[in-house]
Structures are given as C-alpha cells and as structure tokens.
C-alpha cells in the first residue's frame, strides 16, 4: 500500500448524558486510514491537568491501512474549556499535522441553512455600479457561528461587523452582506459564504449567471437530406432561427428562389426553449429536379426588433464528387452481454459531405433513433467519413441474422446508394460480409418517344415520375411501372424496369 495520511475525528459524548456532578470526563481523537505506522497524538488541555492514553493501532481489514484512538481524561472546570488534539504523521511528510479543537461534549443542535441572495439588475437588465450579496444563515440552534466570505476559494478581507443575528423562538438567524464592484462581479469569479458552527462547515456559492438575454439572433438554412432527395423523393429545406427574445413582434420567414420562380407552401413551427428564448423553424418542400439542377433558395428573416433582415441561402454543394466506401463489422461477444451485439459501419472517402445513413433488418428500414451516426468528419485526404453504430438484440439476429448498413449519397452510382450486409454470426449466416448492392434504379423514359428525356441528365430519374413498385405489386404491364408526369404539356413517363 502507498503512503496515506490519516483522517482525524473528534470523539465526544452528548452533553445531556454527562452527570452534572461528574468531576472528570473522557474525550477522544480517532486517527484512521493512515499508512504506514506510526502516528503521534498530543493534546493541548489549556490550564487543566489531564491524562492521555493512546490505544494500539488496529489494521483496517479491507484497505490494510491503520486506525488508532487517543483518549484524554480531564478533571476540574472542563465544561467551558476547549481541547485540541494534534495528530502528526511523519511518513506523509515531516511537518504533516492535523489539529482538531473541540469541547468535552456535543449538544443536540439544528444546523443552519445557508443561502446567498443577490441584488437586482436595473430594468434594462444591466448591472449597477455595485452588487450586494446577502448571506442568510437561518434556522439554527442559538450558538456561536463564524461567517467567512471567499472569492474563488480565497478568504476575503470583509468587515463582518455588519452581520446581524435575530432569534425566532428556539432558532436563530444571521445575515452578512458583501458589496462588490461591478468589475469584480462581471469577472466571472465565484463568491462563497462559509459558515462554521459546532465544528461543522456549511456554505453556499454564487456567480454571475450566463447572459439570459440573447446577444443576437442567428439563422441557419439546411440542405435536403440525400434520403429525402433520392429515396423518399420529397426533399425539404429548413430555415432555423434561434435566440429570439419572446416579444410582441412577429418573426417573419419568407422564402424565395434565385430564379424568381414561385416556391411551395412552407410549414412553420415555434418552440420556447428552457433559457427563455424562442426558436422558429420553417420547412419548405423543394422540387427534386430543381435542387439537382442547382437552384438557389433563400430564407429572409424579419422582426421589428432586428436592425435589418437576416438572409440565408442554400444550394446544391459544388466541387468534386466521390462515392462512399462502406464497411460493416460486428463486434465479438462481450462477457456479460450475450444477448446484445453492436454493429459498426464505417463510411468513408465521400464528397460532398451530405450523406444519409440507414440500417435495414428483415428487408425493412429501421428507425433513425435505433442507430447513432457521427457528423461527417474530414479524412486526411479530401473526402469525408462517418461512423454509424447499431445495437441489436438476440431476438433480432435469431429472427434474421443479416443487417444492412446503407449510405445514400449523390455520387453513389447508379442508385445513389451503397450498402454492405453484416451478420452477428457470419459462419451461420452463409457469409454475408460481401457488399450488397440495391437493385439498380432504371432511368425514366417517355412513353411516347424514344431515348431519355433531356431533364433526366443521364443519371437521375424524372423527379415527378415516382418509382412504382414493379412486377405484380403495381398495376400496369408486367415488369413495367407507369407513372404520369404532373406538369402540363408533357408526355407521361414510364419506368423501363424495376426500381
């Protein structure tokens, strides 16, 4: 065991248990948890005579450390006298000493409640030149108390003559005031009112709170997720406005397109936050084709209290494209958790950073809440990577031991998806570690003309030609999904194969 200094505790009797005619009384000092031996215990008995006896050290079974008790028996006018027990442990250091000063007996007492109150700000939320802190020490059995003010743990030189004590029934209350300059208060220091009473310490601390009034409104505009864009085929963008002060004025969020074309109907949501600020979101459905072709969307935020409108814009990310690589792993069985396994998926070297990660089980997409996926981080090269983690249960892998991690990304060809299957028990599942590709999406052709529509751009289905389900699952000719283009004056489009 390594060197350990002792903890020291005074040992006293309850005053009510000492006979009033007792001519001598014994008190003690416990030194415990030290290593190695020895400790030296000495007593300061003031003007009284006393005899001391230090008991042999005992070993504490669990830790192998030692404990010892020193007893002091005094006679005479001991009732008003204070005694000090000094414990020295030279193995800790040559000058290691702990002093405990206490009286012969302890009275039953009600401890105080310590609470710091602070002076108010002015009406505009600004601090006055000086700030008053009031320490309320309340509800304790009358007796001597000492109040100390600390600044970041250091004792302050404070005039305590202003402290006033009042008694209500059998309990007493004391208050002490501390005046600080605005500069000290704003410096973010912590102020503590420390109360010593009956050998115990009670305290409360305070500091300047974080600004509750927002320093400024912020607005953010998101891009559609690749899942919404390429799979769900109903992309949306969201304008998020945060740190609004709740007030009578209305926040207006207006959408526009750089091309000047009309925008769809947006949905708006307001939420009051815990810090008292307001968050407003507006979600706008955008056309798949419009987004892919590079349309720019603008969100304009106006409010009576804003000096000028906030403008945010978003468009498809430019720059080089790279498809993601997907690797899926199952962690080995961990002792004590035989009925759970963690699956991990590394998706890397993709550009741009917009990516959606999905997990599938039993050929069904699992909820996003089931997995935890990191934000895209830059690789050492020019691409990005994410990790995704899915916890699975025995019931799931016994139902079907194949889980699929899928990345949806614009550069993934031909279907904007790359996926990898993984099994908890690969040997039993018939080796599913190989890459699994989704069936290719087939381009959308016109039912009335040959070749590809120009808008398809060679690799993207016509945005309003919704993928049917194919085969017997969809009305229409076998192996062919028919869907009608909604725009006027254009021929209907059909899929020339399975989705």
């Amino acid at each position: 065991a390594s060197t350990q200094s002792p903890s020291v505790f005074p040992l006293t009797r309850c005053c009510k248990n000492i006979p009033s005619n007792a001519t001598s009384v014994t008190l003690g000092c416990l030194a415990t948890g030290y290593f190695p031996e020895p400790v030296m215990v000495t007593w300061d008995t003031g003007s009284l005579n006393g005899t001391t006896m230090t008991l042999p050290a005992t070993t504490l079974t669990l830790s192998g450390h030692y404990a010892t008790i020193s007893l002091l028996t005094v006679s005479g006018a001991w009732a008003k006298q204070m005694f000090t027990c000094r414990v020295a442990h030279t193995p800790s250091s040559t000058d290691w000493v702990d002093n405990k000063t206490f009286s012969v007996c302890s009275r039953d007492f009600t401890p105080p409640t310590v609470k710091i109150l602070q002076s108010s700000c002015d009406g505009g939320g600004h601090f006055p030149p000086t700030i008053q802190l009031l320490c309320l020490v309340s509800g304790y059995t009358p007796g001597t108390i000492n109040i100390t003010w600390l600044e970041d743990g250091q004792v302050m030189d404070v005039d305590l003559s202003t402290a006033s004590t009042t008694q209500e029934g059998e309990l007493a209350s004391t208050q002490s005031e501390l005046t600080l300059s605005q500069k000290h208060w704003l410096s973010d220091r912590t102020y503590t009112c420390q109360v010593t009473y009956q050998g115990h310490t009670f305290e409360d601390s305070t500091k300047k709170c974080a600004d509750s009034n927002p320093r400024g409104v912020s607005a953010y505009l998101s891009r559609p997720s690749p899942f919404d864009l390429f799979i769900r085929k109903s992309p949306t963008i969201t304008c998020l406005v945060v740190d609004l002060a709740p007030s009578k004025g209305t926040v207006n969020l207006t959408w526009s397109r750089a091309s000047g074309k009309p925008v769809n109907h947006s949905t708006r949501k307001e939420e009051k936050q815990r810090n008292g600020t307001l968050t407003v979101t507006s979600t706008l459905p955008v056309g798949t084709r419009d987004w892919i072709e590079g349309e720019t969307y603008q969100c304009r935020v106006t409010h009576p209290h804003l000096p000028r409108a906030l403008m945010r814009s978003t468009t498809k990310t430019s720059g080089p494209r790279a498809a993601p690589e997907v690797y899926a792993f199952a962690t080995p069985e961990w002792p004590g958790s035989r009925d759970k396994r963690t699956l991990a998926c590394l998706i890397q070297n993709f550009m741009p950073e917009d990516i959606s990660v999905q997990w599938l089980h039993n050929e069904v997409q699992l909820p996003d809440a089931r997995h935890s996926t990191t934000q895209p981080r830059k690789t050492k090269g020019s691409g990005f990577f994410v990790f995704s983690r899915l916890e699975v249960t025995r019931a799931e892998w016994e139902q079907k031991d194949e889980f699929i991690c899928r990345a949806v990304h614009e550069a993934a060809s031909p279907s904007q998806t790359v996926q990898r299957a993984v099994s908890v028990n690969p040997g039993l599942a018939g080796g599913s570690a190989q890459s699994q590709r989704a069936p290719d999406r087939v381009l959308c052709h016109s039912g009335q003309q040959q070749g590809l529509p120009r808008a398809a751009g060679g690799s993207v289905p016509h945005p309003r030609c919704h993928c049917g389900a194919g085969r017997a699952d969809w009305p229409g000719p076998p192996e062919l999904d028919v869907c009608v283009e909604e725009a006027e004056g254009e021929a209907p489009w059909t899929w020339t194969g399975l989705c």
Epitope: I231, R232, V364, L366, P367, T417, D473
Partner: nanobody
C-alpha cells in the same frame, strides 16, 4: 424486432365495409413501402394496394374506387379501407413492409387477417 400485426378482418355481407389495420413495431411505416396483399384459397398472393415513401398510393384494378390505403405516422399504422365488398374479395389479407430499394414481395410480413364476404 420488426413486426407487423393485422386486425379488423371478419365476416361481412356483400356491399358492406371493413377497415383493416396494420400496426408496425420496430420500424417506421413512413420510411418504408407499405402494401396490402391478399390470398384467396388455392390462389397466389396478389397485391391489393401500396403506399410509397412520399405518400403516393396505387391500387390494383380490381379494387380501384372501392379500397383505399392510408397511413398514420403518429400511430405507426397502415390502413386498408374496404367499401362495397364483393364475395370475390374473400381472402386472407396480409400487410407487407419493405425497404424502398427492394423489389416487391420482399420484406417483412404480418400473420394475416381473414376477410369473408357472404
């Protein structure tokens, strides 16, 4: 784990109505393609109606105008409202969920609910 539970089947007279429910657990219905299939005794399983991720729906010619598929995101449930029922609609009705990238007939299935039209 992924589970589908159909309910709402029963015996009904011709011309009557029924509403089938398919309660999903372990996944979100609006993130997957949801379909109703039916299988009459001695026949193959046929698609009745499908609802895509974006909410688009399709119905087999034999039920168009009579059956309607819908979904409730909050209840994570898919419905099949069946009106003007005919004796030939008698079958076991199955709920199917599949990932949108998979071809039809794949995915997870419910146990089925029997609809008898007299």
């Amino acid at each position: 784990d992924v589970q589908l539970q159909e309910s709402g089947g029963g015996l009904v007279q011709a011309g009557g109505s029924l509403r089938l429910s398919c309660a999903a657990s372990g996944f979100i219905v609006s993130d997957n393609v949801m379909s109703w299939y039916r299988q009459a005794p001695g026949k193959q399983r046929d698609m009745v109606a499908t609802i895509m991720l974006n909410g688009d729906t399709a119905h087999a010619d034999s039920v168009k105008g009579r059956f309607t598929i819908s979904r409730d995101h909050a209840k994570n449930t898919v419905y099949l409202q069946m009106n003007s029922l005919k004796p030939e609609d008698t079958a076991v009705y199955y709920c199917n969920a599949r990932d949108s990238m998979l071809e039809p007939g794949r995915g997870a299935w419910g146990q089925g609910t029997l609809v008898t039209v007299s």
